[in-house]
Interface confidence: low
Amino acid sequence: GSGIFQLRLQEFVNQRGMLANGQSCEPGCRTFFRICLKHFQATFSEGPCTFGNVSTPVLGTNSFVVRDKNSGSGRNPLQLPFNFTWPGTFSLNIQAWHTPGDDLRPETSPGNSLISQIIIQGSLAVGKIWRTDEQNDTLTRLSYSYRVICSDNYYGESCSRLCKKRDDHFGHYECQPDGSLSCLPGWTGKYCDQPICLSGCHEQNGYCSKPDECICRPGWQGRLCNECIPHNGCRHGTCSIPWQCACDEGWGGLFCDQDLNYCTHHSPCKNGSTCSNSGPKGYTCTCLPGYTGEHCELGLSKCASNPCRNGGSCKDQENSYHCLCPPGYYGQHCEHSTLTCADSPCFNGGSCRERNQGSSYACECPPNFTGSNCEKKVDRCTSNPCANGGQCQNRGPSRTCRCRPGFTGTHCELHISDCARSPCAHGGTCHDLENGPVCTCPAGFSGRRCEVRITHDACASGPCFNGATCYTGLSPNNFVCNCPYGFVGSRCEFPVGLPPSFPWVA
């Protein structure tokens, strides 16, 4: 059945032991009950008990309390099962009878007599709460309570919804109080037969056959199947679709196993120096002023950066340096002049203008010259026009960019990669042009791959005097002299203190 109407008899009082017809029972009213449950009737009529009927054995004599009993004869509460949708309304007839016969089956005995009867018509919703009532007439009183509950696996306001919990291939659910399915943890769908995969499992690339798993489809991997599997053997690469191998930054080769970016991966250059991915070791360090060594790990003399201006000579000190200035100059870097226009201090055709009532001067320089005495050619590299770490070089009235390996273009703005095999010998710089790599050779070398040693060396003739150190410049014919303390001049030929009868060159 879909539900049960339960009637709990609690107490029956018939103190005088009287029948409905006014006669008394001898020796007392041996009382049993007949219950008839039927559809709601505004006026109760005889006829079939459409919702069910039940009889009790003899429960007591005259007045008695009815105890609860769960099984066997005389069960209380009384059970009236039904197998239809509970309509929410009902009519109930409870009759008390006296029997002179069998206690257990008084219904079959002849000579039964009616003691009293009550009729209840009402509305009753399905629920676990008992509705308690008491009915009196002139001779008797009956206390009772009743309710309607759903049978096992039936739910809802009218016990019309069948739901049987299950946990098998066809579904994984329990039943809600209203009979709707409540999926067990990890299951979803109308019938709770679809597993809920691991949270985040990729919708297309992963699936599951039981809750909280994520099984990857071919070509995918990872806890959530959101990582593609690259080609077998791919070393330093990734994929966006399965079986790809797209190289990470700085790696080359079919399987991304060739290191093109030693500088990035190993950072061999020290003290702020610039690392270039070129040379026989896969890198070259370009040191900042004041440092030397293969990795720029060695500190140079503090004077190495030539801090003294206007021909001043530099002397190292413990943590600093000292500039010895030529006549007519003073200041930490010999940057201030004691000259006036009378001393003709402006070089390269510069015009002299007196200042501060003739105690100082200012030079107005012609085009392409600058400096306080017009002693410097204009450096067109000050605007840092070379990109990607290119070195700027002044070439007469113009300038050029010397690009790092892997870059080309007027401003080194174009990225190239043909120089990866470092074809330039003797530290030559490789430029990858349309027709193949071109090498820019260091001083003393030439040839397409800098493989030819040049015998002519501008420093070979010893152009620097007074023990000065000679450095080869940007071209083999150029040189620079680094003067020892006490000497000045482009070849360090003048001892400090001689009157200037020549133009100073910074």
């Epitope: 009402g122 009753l124 709460i129 509705r131």
Partner: nanobody
């Protein structure tokens, strides 16, 4: 004999108002909870609202909250249902009922009902 007599029903346009009355007799009115339920044709009965003997109010139907108000006048043995902002879906027979106890717990007696029709 317990008697509950409803009145005040009728035809009303959507958005209109009605006030239903339920006059009780045959029992000590102050001691019982009284409520209203309704039943539309072909549908199950639907509880609307109930007021206990102490005056505490319960609403059974979310659909009427904010529109329907129940009140009681113990001196007149009468319970009222003020219905505002009526909708076509409020069309039903409205019954006054009592559980026969002080608290709003079920229906034991009810009246013959009064028809409310909401239509334009």
């Amino acid at each position: 004999e317990v008697q509950l007599v409803e009145s005040g029903g009728g035809l009303v346009q959507p958005g209109g108002s009605l006030r239903l009355s339920c006059t009780a007799s045959g029992f000590t009115f102050d001691d019982y909870a009284i409520g209203w339920f309704r039943q539309a044709p072909g549908k199950e009965p639907e509880g609307i609202s109930c007021i206990s003997s102490s005056g505490s109010i319960t609403y059974d139907a979310d659909s009427v909250k904010g529109r329907f108000t129940i009140s009681r006048d113990n001196a007149k043995n009468t319970v009222y249902l003020q219905m505002n902002s009526l909708k076509p879906e409020d069309t039903a027979v409205y019954y006054c009922a009592t559980p026969g106890i002080a608290a709003c717990r079920g229906i034991h007696y009810w009246g013959q009902g009064t028809q409310v029709t909401v239509s334009s």
